[in-house]
């Protein structure tokens, strides 16, 4: 998988007027890195782990750069012609990434009230737009507001290009975040369901990477996909990864179920514990 | 004594049917999740079906999906094997086998029938 | 779907030596493998299950190890009864069994 570093960026209107505040949200390898979400923005770390990859520093220069890019998203909102009474969103998504063999993307995508309308490749300058007469619209208006200003068009692209994968670079360089692997807490706990059924949930969690296999098994064999429930795979805000899958068994079988679970090649079961008492499985010996 | 017995093999032409049964004694059928396991003349065990104990999981091999069916009787202690569209090299000894329950297993089969033997001729 | 091959296909060995059965999993398999017997016109027995815990009832000469891709079944010292014919399942996902490795008389 690639490094990446998204920006998220919206700004609002309502009845027209483009509100003052904006949010910014970016992800660092997937994972909540730096979030603006007042008047004023202030960049602040989401957890220790980006604390840890941003070192003693202020963020007066992330904060900079995110109070510049949302003054000009809420530019571009203001030009937007399609504005209706009540709340409206434009969203802009920047994302860059570095790969294995060093090779870089970059891309820039705009969405109206969460429909997406306008995408670019930052390195190849190349415009797209979905077929829909409404995204075509919006897309020519934010496309003519953009060519307005010649210098905005060939040298903030560029830079924001470029930019984006220099501050990932940086960050890479802080070496918190290069290819670690974290193994997963794994517990399970049970449940009572109904007419002798109880419910077993198996939970992983303060995992990385994100890629994780988590099944139930009934003396060794997996259950059919169909007989468990699977929760997604979430950030849990600490720069890792939390999940779960559960399913159905008859009270008094418990000894028969375990939890397999398998990442980044080590591998664990995890039994149904006997009682009602919530049984925490450590880290793999 | 814990035993698993076969019946229902014989002699079908091609893109015939054949229903397999196995009848469980000694243990309670109810609670064990059971395959069915082939093995054609001269030739290796060939695993062909897997049900669980609430039949919520069934699984089959590729060389027989869409052609067979396993399906159980708890209360008449039997699993069954309903086998269609039939060709030559279903030509086999069919043995039901029990996964055994033990703790820490892996999907090992404890306890075998003794197998019936299937001919499809064409 | 897991491809189970077993090595040698067949072997000949006397009373008393130490045989060695391999069995390689196309994929990692943890340890989600068992090992059967089979004699002539009988049905398998189960010698192993989860790669190394005996089967209660089997004798202690008998013994697996492998995790991962690759397994071992071994013999420490062959009896006049252990001329049969031997196989590993996994169960990693679904099932399947290995091709088997007959083991007769030198």
């Known amino acids: 998988e690639p490094h990446s570093l998204r920006y998220n960026l919206t700004v609002l209107s309502w009845d027209g007027s483009v509100q003052s505040g904006f949010l910014t949200e970016v992800h660092l390898d997937g994972q909540p890195f730096l979030r603006c979400d007042r008047q004023k923005c202030r960049a602040k770390p989401q957890g220790q782990w980006a604390e840890d990859v941003l070192g003693n520093k202020t963020w007066d220069r992330e904060t900079r750069d995110l109070t510049g890019n949302g003054k000009d998203l809420r530019m571009t909102l203001a030009h937007i012609k399609d504005q209706k009474e009540g709340l409206h969103s434009l969203q802009e998504i920047r994302v860059c990434e570095i790969h294995e063999d060093n090779s870089t993307r970059s891309s820039q995508h705009f969405y109206y009230d969460g429909e997406l309308f306008l995408s670019q490749n930052l390195e190849t300058k190349e415009w797209t737009m979905p077929q829909s007469s409404r995204a075509q619209t919006l897309a020519m208006n934010v496309r003519n507001f953009l060519k307005e200003d010649a210098m905005k068009t060939k040298t903030h692209y560029h830079a924001m290009h470029a930019d984006c994968l220099q501050e990932l670079r940086r960050y890479l360089k802080s070496g918190v975040v290069l290819r670690r692997t974290v193994p997963p807490m794994v517990n399970v706990t049970r449940s009572e369901a109904s007419e002798g059924n109880i419910t077993v949930t198996c939970r992983a969690s303060g995992f990385y990477p994100w890629n994780i296999t988590l099944s139930w098994r009934q003396d060794g064999v997996s259950l059919s996909h169909d007989t468990q429930q699977w929760g997604d795979v979430l950030p849990d805000g600490n720069g890792t990864y939390q999940t779960w899958v559960a399913t159905r068994i008859c009270q008094g079988e418990e000894q028969r179920f375990t939890c397999y679970m398998e990442h980044s090649g080590n591998h664990s079961t995890h039994p149904v514990p006997s009682g009602k008492v919530l049984v925490l499985q450590s880290h793999w010996q | 004594e814990v035993q698993l017995v076969e019946s229902g093999g014989g002699l079908v032409q091609s893109g015939g049917s054949l229903r397999l049964s196995c009848v469980a004694s000694?243990?309670?059928?109810?609670?064990?999740?059971m395959n069915w396991v082939r093995q054609a003349p001269g030739k290796g065990l060939e695993w062909i079906s897997y049900i669980n104990s609430r039949s919520n999981t069934i699984y089959y091999a590729d060389s027989v999906k869409g052609r067979f069916t396993i399906s159980r009787d708890n209360a008449k202690k039997s699993l069954y094997l309903q086998m269609n569209s039939l060709r030559d090299e279903d030509t086999a000894v069919y043995y039901c086998a029990r996964v055994s329950d033990i703790t820490g297993n892996t999907g090992a089969f404890d306890i075998w029938g003794q197998g019936t033997m299937v001919t499809v001729s064409s | 779907d897991i491809q189970m091959t077993q090595s040698p296909s067949s072997l000949s060995a006397s009373v008393g030596d130490r045989v060695t059965i391999t069995c390689r999993a196309s994929q990692s398999i943890s340890s989600y493998l068992n090992w059967y017997q089979q004699k002539p016109g009988k049905a398998p027995k189960l010698l192993i299950y989860a790669a190394s815990s005996l089967q209660s009832g089997v004798p202690s000469r008998f013994s697996g190890s492998g995790s991962g891709t690759d397994f071992t079944l071994t013999i420490s010292s062959l009896q006049p009864e252990d001329f049969a014919t031997y196989y590993c399942?996994?169960?990693?996902?679904?099932?399947?069994f290995g091709g088997g490795t007959k083991v007769d008389i030198k």
């Open positions: 000694g243990f309670t059928l109810s609670r064990y999740s």
């Open positions: 399942q996994q169960s990693y996902s679904t099932l399947t």
